[in-house]
Amino acid sequence: MQLSQVSDLLTQEQANLTHQKKKLEGQISARQQAEEASQESENELKEMIETLARKLNEKSKEQMELHHQNLNLQETLKRVANCSAPCPQDWIWHGENCYLFSSGSFNWEKSQEKCLSLDAKLLKINSTADLDFIQQAISYSSFPFWMGLSRRNPSYPWLWEDGSPLMPHLFRVRGAVSQTYPSGTCAYIQRGAVYAENCILAAFSICQKKANLRAQ
């Protein structure tokens, strides 16, 4: 074998080895990349698992909270079921009282009689909140409504049926305040204002009674 042939063989072998080396380097690089990718995936998976565990924990807490709320609601419903309605049918409930707006027009005494027959009295306004409610309730109507405020003659103070005096800060009685009528002077509310009038005249009326706010 000649020297030139040996040289050719060595060159070929070298080229072979270089190719093998590059191939191996490529494989090693690919494996490293795969390992890195695998590590990244593993880290991502770990994070996902942690996030899911955290969310699951939060949801468990929410579920527990909802369960307690549900129990409370069930308890409330039981209590409500044991309560009768605060007001009879057709009466309007507001605060501590029930109100009935009459469908008939009568004089003051007849109106009082109607309320008494329903275990109620004529309207008494105790506060500005009561007044606001009544004004709003009758705002649809232009009719006068008798209330439980009256006096025998102008020298007497305005008194509610229960004997208590009218609080001057609530409202001012307008109209025939200085007139004397044989049947007395009674107050009615119309379009949000309160007027004095002969008790013998006919008007609608508002009955009032305490709401049943106690459990059975």
Partner: nanobody
């Protein structure tokens, strides 16, 4: 106008009883409702009990089950039977119609004290 005269008050021990009377100078038969009121010193007058001409009665929560209102229309008299009296029942008691009140009488003093 009808005049009213209340009587029957007095000093009584807690747990005791009294019967108040109210004599009217005119007919109470046609009145929708007669009532007993009371006023303690420094307090507003309050409705204690009422009796309608159809026989319905109404009582303040504080006296329910202890006080009874009744009337004798023939005598134009209204009564208030007060049992199981308490110190907080101490007041001057008045009778009058329920609403469209007549002139108030002198009232009758009820004192509950040991």
């Amino acid at each position: 106008e009808v005049q009213l005269v209340e009587s029957g008050g007095g000093l009584v021990q807690p747990g005791g009883s009294l019967r108040l009377s109210c004599a009217a100078s005119g007919s109470i038969f046609t009145i929708n409702a007669m009532a007993w009121y009371r006023q303690a010193p420094g307090k507003q007058r309050e409705l204690v009990a009422h009796l309608t001409n159809s026989g319905r009665t109404g009582y303040a929560d504080s006296v329910k089950g202890r006080f009874t209102i009744s009337s004798d229309n023939a005598k134009n008299t209204v009564y208030l039977q007060m049992n199981s009296l308490k110190p907080e029942d101490t007041a001057v008691y008045y009778c009058n119609r329920l609403g469209l009140h007549w002139s108030w009488g002198q009232g009758t003093q009820v004192t509950v004290s040991s």
